[in-house]
Interface confidence: low
């Protein structure tokens, strides 16, 4: 808490400019009007304030806006954002994607902080769903963002947003998350032709049910072993040898190298030896 002191004569700030970097903390508190600061927040980032000085400026804004800052101020917080606590951010109502981008830019290159996580949560809740533009922005800053969401949170992702998802964005997703994302992807890509569809849906197939895999096996997709190994075991088990052969196409020979790993191991154990022998790979059920 900065002690309340009168502003020395001639030091009252008329605008937010570089002369303020020479002000002591108590002078900033006494001589900078909070309303002036709020209207000229965009200038703060151009001035090399110390972190101690930024603490004072934050304090002034907190006094002016005890219920939470307006978006006009939030958008121009810049490095002052790093001073905010999750509790501060929970008071905000952020609706502009430009505001979100500006604040994420401040944190760029760092791990997702609790402040950023809270900001994103407030933003997405305010929008009601995780739309394509938001998802584009978030995955650009944090490639693992999508997989940090719970299945329930992923439920609010509309199928149209799936177009923004890149394969690397799904790298850390677990099966429960893919279970939610896969049907959305299927809807999103439903109008694509067979080969294009497979390219797009491939990253999501860890959430595919058995019958969708059966259907894919009829479409000459030649799934690679890396994708096959990420499929749900319960979805793979009911597939026949013929269906797996069609699904993998020329990649079927890779089953031998993976015969001790799930889901290949469990699938092999479900098959008749006579059927496995038709593959000519020496797989033992």
């Amino acid at each position: 808490e900065v002690e309340k002191t009168a502003c020395p004569s001639g030091k009252k700030a008329r605008e937010i400019d570089e002369s303020l970097i020479f002000y002591k903390k108590w002078e900033l508190e006494a001589c900078v009007d909070a309303a002036l600061l709020a209207t000229q927040m965009d200038r703060v980032n151009a001035i090399p304030f110390t972190y101690e000085q930024l603490d004072v400026l934050k304090h002034k804004l907190d006094e002016l806006y005890p219920q939470g800052y307006p978006e006009s101020v939030i958008q121009h917080l810049g490095y002052l954002f790093l001073k905010m606590s999750p509790e501060d951010i929970r008071k905000w109502n952020v609706t502009s994607l430009e505001t979100l981008k500006a604040l994420l830019e401040v944190n760029k290159g760092h791990e997702m902080s609790p402040q950023v996580a809270t900001l994103i949560d407030r933003f997405v809740k305010g929008r009601g769903q995780l739309d394509k533009d938001t998802l584009d922005t978030l995955t650009a800053f944090y490639p693992g963002y999508l997989c940090s969401l719970s299945p329930e949170e992923l439920s609010s992702v509309p199928p149209s947003s799936i177009w923004a998802v890149r394969p690397q964005d799904l790298d850390t997703c677990d099966p429960r998350q893919l279970d939610v994302l896969y049907p959305k992807a299927r809807l999103a890509f439903q109008n694509m032709n067979g080969s294009e569809y497979f390219v797009k849906i491939q990253s999501f197939l860890g959430g595919a049910p058995t019958e969708d895999l059966k259907a894919l096996s009829q479409q000459n997709v030649s799934m690679d072993l890396a994708t096959f190994m990420k499929l749900r075991t319960d979805a793979v088990l009911p597939l026949t040898v013929a269906e797996v052969q069609k699904l993998l196409g020329p990649h079927v020979e890779g089953l031998k190298a993976e015969e001790r790993h799930r889901p290949v191991r469990d699938w092999i154990l479900r098959q008749r030896q006579d059927d496995l022998d038709t593959l000519g790979l020496g797989l033992q059920g």
Partner: antibody
Framework: EVQLLESGGGLVQPGGSLRLSCAAS????????MTWVRQAPGKGLEWVSG????????YYADTVKGRFTISRDNSKNTLYLQMNSLRAEDTAVYYC????????????WGQGTLVTVSS | DIQMTQSPSSLSASVGDRVTITCRSS??????LAWYQQKPEKAPQSLIY???SLQSGVPSRFSGSGSGTDFTLTISNLQPEDFATYYC?????????FGGGTKVEIK
Amino acid sequence: EVQLLESGGGLVQPGGSLRLSCAASGLTFRSYAMTWVRQAPGKGLEWVSGISVSGGITYYADTVKGRFTISRDNSKNTLYLQMNSLRAEDTAVYYCAKRGAAVGSFDYWGQGTLVTVSS
Amino acid sequence: DIQMTQSPSSLSASVGDRVTITCRSSQGIGSWLAWYQQKPEKAPQSLIYAASSLQSGVPSRFSGSGSGTDFTLTISNLQPEDFATYYCQQYNSYPLTFGGGTKVEIK
């Protein structure tokens, strides 16, 4: 054994409201998307509305959009259909159904509940 | 919306006959098609999903085929309990849509 039991149907005047319920047993309700399908007397099947496992995503036929609301309470294993501004053409047997392994196919259906909209 | 057209709308057949019902979609739906059987005053029952996969517990005399826009349900050895109305349904995209139904009656 999977069982879906609809209730809440009855006679209602045009413009009125009804809330249908579908109590599910014999399945892990929270793991399945659910749907409502209706059948007007002597007519074919018409899909009405669907809902995701968490309730976060809902889908509606154009004929009911803005008037009907689908919801679910996973703690009670129950699916709901709130029907407002009912019209004569909403008269039908309403079935709730559980999605099968495929996203939009349905492997178990309730016995249906009749909704009659008439003055 | 995707329109589903079934034919014929009704047919008469005898026990032991081979019966074929066709379903055509107004645009390509891949293999995202299901078939249901409905008896009078009863709820529909699932027969086939993914165009050709037999639902658990359904007799093997029922089979499905097709992909894209043209699909077929075949009952190879019609039994007394098979006299009912059959519906196809696409689940390629929302809104989900059903065919108008085919009523299979005793000749």
